[in-house]
């Protein structure tokens, strides 16, 4: 192309092309003319001497490039009711729906809306929300790791870490918290709490002896309510 | 608080024993308890441990060949057929992260 | 199960000395360790728990430290009380309580 701006229609050097993103080659005119922006289509084509004439896209139509479109794009249904709008229809993009909470897109079209949802699978006990989706976007359960647990049906709980025990009743396994033991009684010089870092991916948490139910989200370990009483000693 | 093993005699191989285990000063029911043993001039050895809801875990080496039992008061382990391989003092001990209640342990010879 | 491979077997120090055990697990245990003391006829004795917690009453010249795979006991200002076999200890939550112990240090003091 050469260049200088040229001005539409105009007949194109040899061995030179129409500028492909806004223009087209009329075979009929024989000359490079303009395309029509995105949110209108052609109204009439060109010829030898006048160019393209374009007209606004009506409602519930689009388009999104620029184009030589004798009509607008029909827009998508409006999206179902497990569905969310994230993107409204206009004369330049297409509406786009997706899955509300809960639901995974089990058909997507070729723009990347939803066409239909379908709810997520829920992991039982002994299992726990991976942190990567099936292809489809469906939830993947895996088995809780030793050391951790899940004892909820959920499409969001993942295995969290055994409450940790200084002094052991029952020990946790994959679909149950470990139960920790009374502390003994004779640890009861100068009071502190003891504070111990947890495995990944928990965050430090005061040691508990008792068990307390569960204040913190999901991926973090309940440690209880009740610290330790710690002789003052160093170390720990 | 004070734990103390008993039961431990001299015994001929094959025949079963059992031992025993008594803890004063805690409530015992609220405690998982473990048996660890040690072989004359040996290290330590843990066998396995009883929780509250009496399940038992044992070590893979220990499995079939021992048995942990409770009641309320005390915790019992049960050499089903000794060899001379099980001659050892058992010690009897909490489970957790912090295992300090220990006993003097009671010793098991076996031999013919 | 867990192997707990302790090294070295004995050691040798003075008194006032430092003396270094090492204890390495099979797999990782967190900070789920414990150091024990064990004299001849006696039950062995909690130090250290939680890898570098000091248990109630045991100086402070008794140091753990560690985690994953790889711990440590550090005994500084040895005495002639500190002559003993040093056992560590498996605490892993793995489903069950695993209770492995490494094979012992025997630590002289001259």
């Known amino acids: 192309v050469p260049a200088q701006v040229v001005l539409t229609p105009y007949k194109p050097e040899p061995g030179y092309e129409c500028q492909i993103s806004q223009e087209y080659y009329d075979r009929k005119a024989q000359m490079c003319c303009a395309k029509c922006p995105p949110g209108q289509y052609v109204k009439h084509f060109c010829n030898k001497t006048s160019d393209t004439v374009c007209a606004d896209c009506e409602a519930s139509m689009y388009t999104q490039v620029w184009n030589q479109f004798r009509t607008c794009l029909s827009c998508s249904s409006s999206c179902t009711t497990d569905q969310v709008e994230i993107r409204a229809c206009t004369k330049q993009q297409n509406r786009v729906c997706a899955c509300e909470a809960g639901r995974y897109c089990a058909l997507k079209t070729h723009s990347g809306s939803c066409r239909q949802c379908m709810r997520l699978s829920k992991c039982g006990p002994g299992f726990g929300v991976a942190s990567s989706r099936a292809p489809n976007g469906n939830v993947l359960c895996k088995a809780c790791a030793p050391g951790t647990f899940s004892d909820t049906t959920s499409s969001t709980d993942v295995c969290r870490p055994h409450r940790i025990c200084s002094i052991l009743a029952i020990p946790g396994n994959a679909s149950t918290d470990a139960v920790c033991a009374p502390e003994s009684p004779t640890l009861s010089a100068i009071p502190r709490t003891l504070y111990v870092s947890q495995p990944e991916p928990t965050r430090s948490q005061p040691l508990d002896q008792e068990p307390g139910p569960s204040q913190t989200p999901s991926i973090l370990t309940s440690l209880g309510s009740t610290p330790i009483i710690e002789q003052s000693t160093k170390g720990g | 608080q004070s734990v103390e093993e008993s039961g431990g005699r001299l015994v001929a191989p094959g025949t079963p024993l059992t031992l025993t285990c008594t803890v004063s000063?805690?409530?015992?029911?609220?405690?998982?308890m473990a048996w660890v043993r040690q072989a004359p001039g040996k290290g330590l050895e843990y066998i396995g441990y009883?929780?509250?809801?009496?399940s038992t875990y044992y070590a893979t080496w220990a499995k079939g060949r021992f048995t942990i039992s409770r009641t309320s008061t005390t915790v019992h382990l049960k050499i089903a057929s000794p060899t001379t391989e099980d001659t050892a003092t058992y010690f009897c001990t909490n489970v957790g992260v912090r295992m300090y209640l220990w006993g003097p342990g009671t010793l098991v010879t076996v031999s013919s | 199960d867990v192997v707990m491979t302790q090294t070295p077997a004995s050691v040798e120090a003075a008194v006032g000395g430092t003396v270094t055990i090492k204890c390495q697990a099979s797999?990782?245990?967190?900070?789920?360790l414990s150091w024990y003391q064990q004299k001849p006829g006696q039950p062995p004795k909690l130090l250290i728990y939680r890898a570098s917690t000091l248990e109630s009453g045991v100086p402070s010249r008794f140091k753990g430290s560690g985690s994953g795979t790889e711990f440590t006991l550090t005994i500084s200002d040895l005495e002639c009380a500190d002559a003993a076999t040093y056992y560590c200890q498996c605490g892993y939550y793995g489903g069950s309580y695993i209770g492995a112990f490494g094979g012992g240090t025997e630590v002289v003091v001259k």
């Open positions: 000063g805690i409530d015992l029911s609220r405690y998982a």
């Open positions: 009883i929780d509250t809801g009496d």
């Open positions: 797999q990782s245990i967190s900070s789920y």
